[in-house]
């Protein structure tokens, strides 16, 4: 309840997160014209990325363009990228939608289509659908430990969400263990009324709200966090207009003294931790 006699001040907060979990990924691998099932293990270093601020990212799906090299090749025939003669291709032109610099030549991409030749990482990335179901759908069982230190400088009061009595093997539950700061990712989605399996395909942004409503008066002291969850990205975005959450990164390597890279389009969940609240004292 609002205590009008108290002096209130907003919370100052710092957050640190640690994600844990292992995923086994099965995908088709093609070598020498033979396609077979490949199995790989993903650990924390493979699926999480350091983010700025109070956020962390968990990759749930990906599309790979393996073994790209810097050379000349036809541009991917996306909408409007096809050509019928060299006149359509402008030497030195860098189309923002393109993956390279045009050479001025119109070359065959396949038996039926021609596109402008580019100097780029080749072959240029294909416009592929994200795999369904998501490759790292088992990320639903990953857990994240959230460490949240808070401070009310005007009241010279500091505390944190992790208590000395806290059990390291607990898992947050709204009813049974509302003070546990280890969260199962699938539970976060469930609490927010979202389907993890579905969001994992294209990615999304999930908010973890930590609300501190602190009464710092010694006779009725109470200062514990309350956790709530809600999806932050627009899930109703028209499919044609950049749905979900994704970004690209590359792994570089040398083979026979030639620099190559594997380009990975990573889809996943960005978790934003939003800490707010007030501390009140007479």
């Amino acid at each position: 309840s609002d205590k009008l006699y108290q002096r209130k001040e907003p919370v100052i907060s710092s957050v640190h997160t640690k994600v844990k979990g292992i995923a086994e990924v099965t995908e088709n691998v093609t070598e020498g014209g033979v396609t077979k099932l490949g199995h790989s293990i993903f650990d924390t270093a493979d699926y999480t990325f350091p983010l700025q601020g109070n956020s962390f990212f968990v990759m749930t799906n990906y599309v790979k363009s393996e073994g790209q090299v810097q050379t000349l090749c036809p541009e991917y025939p996306r909408r409007g990228a096809q050509c019928s003669s060299d006149r359509r291709c402008k030497k030195g032109w860098m189309d923002p939608q393109s993956k390279g610099i045009q050479t001025g030549r119109c070359v065959p991409y396949d038996k039926t289509r021609k596109t402008c030749e580019v100097s780029a990482w080749c072959p240029t990335e294909e416009e592929k659908e994200a795999p369904r179901p998501a490759l790292l759908r088992s990320a639903e069982n990953f857990t994240v430990l959230i460490k949240n230190n808070i401070h009310f400088p005007g009241h010279n009061y500091t505390t944190r969400n992790i208590l000395p009595t806290m059990n390291g093997s607990c898992t947050f539950h709204k009813t049974w263990d509302p003070q546990c700061s280890i969260f199962r990712l699938g539970d976060i989605f469930q609490e927010a009324g979202e389907n993890f399996t579905e969001v994992a395909v294209q990615g999304g942004i999930m908010g973890i709200e930590i609300y501190w409503d602190c009464n710092l008066d010694s006779w009725s002291h109470h200062c514990r966090p309350r956790y709530s969850f809600r999806r932050l990205d627009d899930k109703n975005t028209d499919e044609s207009f950049v749905p979900g959450y994704n970004f690209r990164y590359a792994k570089y390597y040398k083979e026979n003294n030639v620099e190559k890279r594997t380009l990975i389009k990573a889809f996943g969940i960005r978790f934003d931790i939003l800490v707010f609240g007030t501390g009140g004292k007479f």
Partner: nanobody, 127 residues
């Protein structure tokens, strides 16, 4: 099943020229990159040259760059290797093969990315 038959090999003096051909039958190979490999006695099979499916892009091993030219005629389902200024170290059995992937730009020189090698044609360069 694809059959690849090489021809055009023989004995030639150093500095001379030969033109190898590789005729494909059994299925069209115009959708595939193709390549030439060679194997000298007591040595591993090595990549020589490759050409992408459309014939626009070619790749060579450093030691033959500027002397050998790979080309293809998709209407005849045939691959060629024009070899000029031959050297004694070019002596080997030459095989043609077609590229099964993935990614010709990156893996054109990798023997495991090719399938259905032919029987080969012997090239001997005398000094």
């Amino acid at each position: 099943e694809v059959q690849l038959v090489e021809s055009g090999g023989g004995l030639v003096q150093a500095g001379g020229s030969l033109r190898l051909s590789c005729a494909a039958s059994g299925r069209t190979v115009s959708d595939y990159g193709m390549g030439w490999f060679r194997q000298a006695p007591g040595k591993l099979r090595e990549f020589v040259a490759s050409i992408n499916w459309s014939g626009i892009y070619t790749r060579y091993i450093d030691s033959v760059e500027g002397r050998f030219t790979i080309s293809r005629d998709n209407t005849k389902n045939t691959l060629y290797l024009q070899m000029n200024n031959l050297k004694a170290e070019d002596t080997a059995v030459y095989y043609c093969a077609y590229f099964l992937g993935p990614n010709w730009y990156s893996n054109y020189g990798r023997p495991s990315s090719y399938g259905f090698y032919g029987q080969g044609t012997q090239v001997t360069v005398s000094s």
